[in-house]
Amino acid sequence: GWVWNQFFVPEEMNTTSHHVGRLRSDLDNGNNSFQYKLLGAGAGSTFIIDERTGDIYAIEKLDREERSLYILRAQVIDITTGRAVEPESEFVIKVSDINDNEPKFLDEPYEAIVPEMSPEGTLVIQVTASDADDPSSGNNARLLYSLLQGQPYFSVEPTTGVIRISSKMDRELQDEYWVIIQAKDMIGQPGALSGTTSVLIKLSDVNDNKPIFKESLYRLTVSESAPTGTSIGTIMAYDNDIGENAEMDYSIEEDDSQTFDIITNHETQEGIVILKKKVNFEHQNHYGIRAKVKNHHVDEQLMKYHTEASTTFIKIQVEDVDEPPLFLLPYYIFEIFEETPQGSFVGVVSATDPDNRKSPIRYSITRSKVFNIDDNGTITTTNSLDREISAWYNLSITATEKYNIEQISSIPVYVQVLNINDHAPEFSQYYESYVCENAGSGQVIQTISAVDRDESIEEHHFYFNLSVEDTNSSSFTIIDNQDNTAVILTNRTGFNLQEEPIFYISILIADNGIPSLTSTNTLTIHVCDCDDSGSTQTCQYQELMLSMGFKTE
């Protein structure tokens, strides 16, 4: 049978020929009658065999990390017979390891993020080195990790490569650290090979700083003319944290007047002081308010850093604005009777300068020929007023400061012209009537009505009468209907077109005013030739008849 021990060849041997071992048949008596042959991968190129002795040699430098074993086949032949002495056999040559590979960190670059203020022992990252040497061969691939740079903040577990925090760190002092880790094989013994890697450790922010006002006092100004909602200035606190942890909210802590508000601009992290109520320099020319600032997000476990909010004092000066005159009333209504003489008193308006200097006021009326105003605000008439022409006047009164004529205010003044009974009633229209020659007594000739241009206090009431002359000699009579109308009737039978073609009747109309006014109104009555049915045949004025719808032949 075959006789051999397990074959090993050390890697990286520089000799041209390295004896690996010997394989032989136990039938070989050493008389050189056997021939040994080597077959398979590496036979003849990597390994050779002494055909006579069966000694195997490595003729090539081997690298265990490239290939750690070779499976070859061996034959032994009796030279005298040419026959195989032993059955062909397979054997293994193993390449034994030497420590020729340093540890390598294959996952570089390493980067880790850990919250600032993390307690000692907090795991940061694990780094792992690989050693291509044989882990089963002594300590060639047994690694020990150590820290070359990073004390006293970090430590590394020697056998695992786990990096831990060994001292609390404040991101606001330093936000990143370069740690250098060394891996040594041979568990650090003499002759060990080493490799290093760098780890960038970044500290993430925790909310361990509250926002603080750098200024203990802010001075702001606001114009008294500023509308509500006006931004009058900004205040700013600073927070050493970053991102969400630096987001802050401003608020008013003290403002007895409740005149101001503070809103937060979350983009710039500024506090904007806003006017909540209008200010008046003459009423109060300065204010003092206290503002505070707090973080927007605070975790429960970090509340200890945020116990007392930072505050600041804000002094706000109100700027005086030269304001226009202020009328006592927003508008005025005055009354005056018509027909009062020029220069009559209408009313008084009053405006004052709201500013401290109390400028005298001048008054004027915009585009009026009927009224005048003096420097005391007294309005008088420049003409007699006729209510029947205009019953109301809408005036625009302007008040101007004497010391600053650009400061102007205007208000409306309404003047009502009151009625007096200065118009008598009169016919509501022009009346022209006719009567047939053959008309009988008591026949209705015309219904008349009247109008009065005066304003009726309660209700107009008109009284109709014939003049004294017409009453005595009239062929006609009048009946007052008591409803502001009257009817004219014939007072005889028969009329003569030839003798008296036209009658002019004077009618008196009186009103119920105090004193009562009366007018005389003339009614014209034409005499016409009529047929038996009363249809008009001929009147003196043909065109009149036509206009009244009468036929003429």
Epitope: A41, S68, R73
Partner: antibody
């Protein structure tokens, strides 16, 4: 897991040099215990081993192609390359790259292959 | 150089049947150095068996390998539709080489 991807021109003129690159992803070409190999397959035919390389640069070639073949490695790019000179139409084939387990010699995994045609 | 000869060149079988593929080496090959591959049209070969009998990761147990010396066998116990392909053996005993392939086609 390791993946391989061949790249290079699909058409080469006769007498010129065929050049292909294999990019390794999902693992390091510098890992011990592996060879990085090229294999080709003529249209409708079987597989022919061309050669392989260890990341430290040692090469092994098919004796029948040895005079024309060069395999090189670029560990910084995790790539290895094939150059086949003086090509003829007989070199038209699908070229594969693959990883070889050095102790026992099996090929796994393989790239998807790239067809190279030699024609004027 | 070791030459691998596969037989038969083509195997016509129906799904569910057993397939037996042979690979013969021109000289003895260590079983550790013998592997089998499957190749489907338009795809790269895929490792099935290494060390003559060990299934690669993800290979169904209907595939098995055996043999030693110069004679090796790949057996597919029960053919599935996806098993119809070309199969190659490969040795590493000297310079790597492949057999010419056996095509397993649907009958």
């Amino acid at each position: 897991q390791v993946q391989l991807q061949e790249s290079g021109p699909g058409l080469v003129k006769p007498s010129q040099t065929l050049s292909l690159t294999c990019t390794v992803s999902g693992g390091s070409i510098s890992s011990g215990g592996y060879y990085w190999s090229w294999i080709r397959q003529h249209p409708g035919k079987g597989l022919e081993w061309i050669g392989y390389i260890y990341y430290r640069g040692r090469t092994y070639y098919n004796p029948s192609l040895k005079s024309r073949v060069t395999i090189s490695v670029d560990t910084s790019k995790n790539q290895f390359s094939l150059k086949l000179s003086s090509v003829t139409a007989a070199d038209t084939a699908v070229y594969y790259c693959a990883r070889v387990y050095s102790n026992y010699g099996w090929f796994d995994p393989w790239g998807q292959g790239t067809l190279v045609t030699v024609s004027s | 150089e070791i030459v691998l000869t596969q037989s038969p060149g083509t195997l016509s079988l129906s799904p569910g049947e057993r397939a037996t593929l042979s690979c013969r080496a021109s000289q003895s090959v260590s079983s550790s150095y013998l592997a089998w591959y499957q190749q489907k049209p338009g795809q790269a070969p895929r490792l099935l068996i290494y060390g003559a009998s060990t299934r690669a990761t993800g290979i169904p147990d209907r595939f098995s390998g055996s043999g030693s010396g110069t004679d090796f066998t790949l057996t597919i116990s029960r053919l599935e539709p996806e098993d119809f392909a070309v199969y190659y053996c490969q040795q590493y005993g000297s310079s790597p080489s492949f057999g010419q392939g056996t095509k397993v086609e649907i009958k």
